[in-house]
């Protein structure tokens, strides 16, 4: 991983990079390598494409071995017919203050999202729009015999419910989390990302997790039964250890992977969950990375194009662990 005194390059000649991928010097200034692209794993030795404004985001300072290529100047957002730069804040209406972050818009309510539970003083609370005011306000429907300032004595109707969905509420924060993007690699270790404001200060942040749709070395077509065209979730023979840039997972995992088809369809994760995985590196360092674990796969004709640079953003979003609303990854 680290730059040693003497340069050692994998090949004498410069590698041939795919179209649109820059040939750059590695982080040690030794060898010419193909620059890593948006969402790919990067290290000191494997730098991100500087010509596309990418940098290697290592996350926490303690985790300076492996990062993810991230855009310095993120993708703009189109919202309500207007284009906003990444990082730009705007008011979508009198009720919401929004921010663009890497192509995703997140909004924080300017009006109080407070919930009011019934009480003797306010037996039937409800929010109403008052003339000339942007934000709705609480009013308390009261019985006719109510005194001017004392509490109400009327019974509360059990069938009434009040306020927005409690699972999506945090004080004055409209919790928004995008689906996880598709894995950046169709086989082997890749990256999946999402944008959320499900954090203490309701700030938009980009989260990433490792993902492996299937191992590259597995010849899954062999396992397709006669007369069948697909193998959706092949059985894994034995528990596996994950590898990440020379580091190996501490535990073994009986992970599910997605299979393949012989009829032109592709199989991708459908329901997933996110769990932390500890990797041990040759120098003894332990690092923890969140990783996607597949619950179910789906086979379909909605396959990514070979050269679709937007595939990881728009293609086959994954379901199943939209913001764990009470955990922070």
């Amino acid at each position: 991983q680290d730059c040693s005194a003497q340069c050692q390059c994998a090949a004498e000649a410069a590698p041939h990079c795919p179209a649109g991928v820059s040939l750059v010097l590695d982080g040690c200034g030794c060898c010419r390598v193909c620059a890593k692209q948006l969402g790919e794993l990067c290290t000191e030795r494997d730098p991100c494409d500087p010509h596309k404004g990418l940098f290697c985001d290592f996350g926490s300072p303690a985790n300076r071995k492996i990062g993810v290529c991230t855009a310095k100047d993120g993708a703009p957002c189109v919202f309500g017919g207007s284009v906003y730069r990444s990082g730009e804040s705007f008011q979508s209406s009198c009720k919401y203050q929004c921010t663009c972050l890497d192509g995703a818009v997140g909004c924080v309510p300017l009006c109080s999202m407070d919930v009011r539970l019934p009480s003797p003083d306010c037996p039937f609370p409800r929010r109403v729009k008052l003339p000339g005011k942007c934000c709705e306000e609480w009013v308390c429907d009261e019985p006719k015999d109510r005194t001017a300032v004392g509490p109400a004595l009327a019974a509360y109707r059990l069938e009434d419910t009040f306020g927005p969905d409690p699972t999506m509420m945090r004080a004055n924060c409209l919790v928004q989390t995008t689906e996880w993007s598709a894995c950046s690699k169709t086989c082997g270790m890749g990256i999946s990302t999402r944008v959320t404001n499900d954090n203490t200060f309701c700030r938009l942040e980009k989260q990433s997790r490792l993902c492996m749709v299937r191992p590259c070395e597995a010849d899954l077509e062999e396992n397709i039964k006669k007369g069948k065209k697909c193998i959706r979730t092949p059985k894994i023979a034995k528990p596996v250890k994950f590898e990440l840039s020379g580091c190996t997972s501490v535990k073994t995992y009986r992970a599910k992977f997605c299979g393949v088809c012989t009829d032109g369809r592709c199989c991708t994760p459908h329901r997933t969950t996110t769990l932390p995985v500890e990797f041990k590196c040759p120098d003894g360092e332990i690092m923890k990375k969140n990783m996607m674990f597949i619950k179910t796969c789906a086979c379909h004709y909605n396959c990514p194009g070979d050269n679709d640079i937007f595939e990881s953003l728009y293609y086959r979003k994954m379901y199943g662990d939209m913001a764990h609303h009470h955990h922070h990854h």
Epitope: P120, D121, P151, A155
Partner: antibody
């Protein structure tokens, strides 16, 4: 963000008057009432009184003669006054928002001792 | 003097179901008592869980439910989690004043 914060003296002499202030933010005192509750050391909660959103008050009958609760809506403050304090009034005093007692202050511990 | 009574302590295993009750000394609890349930975890502030008999606060998980059960107010926890270990107080409204119960210390085994 909804918050309530109690403030006042930590030590009061017997027969003196205790005055506590509850400063609220994140909601209006014209929309929500505020309750006062106390918890003596090692014991349960005891409801003391409330000032409703429209200014009316209700008190625990046991404290009626000693208690006054008022508010300054523009300052977002509720003032709690208890006269003729006694060592048995030693407790942590809390203010809490009406509507399910949903939000509480952290409490202020008051010791009554000479 | 009106007395509100709760179980002093209850013990439950993780994943289990437990019901805490709140009894009034002057008769059956009704919706006019606006039963409230308040939680205090060790070292944390009090916070309301349920108001108006059965309405959950925004932060109250769906595994907590408030109801009236056999003339008492009840708080039922289904699929109990270790983090539910806490002191639980009920409060009932009696036309001019609230009365708090003595509290239930809920212990989650394991």
């Amino acid at each position: 963000e909804v918050t309530l914060k109690e403030s006042g003296p930590v030590l009061v002499k017997p027969t003196e008057t205790l005055t506590l202030t509850c400063t609220v933010s994140g909601f209006s005192l014209s929309t929500f009432g505020v309750h006062w509750i106390r918890q003596p050391p090692g014991k349960g909660l005891e409801w003391l009184g409330v000032i409703w959103r429209r200014g009316g008050t209700d008190y625990n009958a046991a404290f009626m003669s000693r208690l006054t609760i008022s508010k300054d809506t523009s300052k977002s403050q509720v003032v709690f006054t208890m006269t003729n304090m006694d060592p048995v009034d030693t407790a942590t005093y809390y203010c809490a928002r009406d509507g399910g007692f949903d939000y509480w202050g952290q409490g202020t511990t008051v010791t009554v001792s000479s | 003097e009106t007395v509100v009574t709760q179980e002093p302590s209850l013990t439950v295993s993780p994943g289990g179901t437990v019901t805490l009750t709140c009894r009034s000394s002057i008769g059956a609890v009704t919706t006019s008592n606006y039963a409230n349930w308040v939680q205090q975890k060790p070292g944390q502030a009090f916070r309301g869980l349920i108001g108006g008999t059965s309405n959950r606060a925004p932060w109250t998980p769906a595994r907590f439910s408030g109801s009236l059960l056999g003339g008492k107010a009840a708080l039922t926890l289904s699929g109990v989690q270790p983090e539910d270990e806490a002191e639980y107080y009920c409060a009932l409204w009696y036309s001019t004043h609230y009365v708090f119960g003595g509290g239930t210390k809920l212990t989650v085994l394991g």
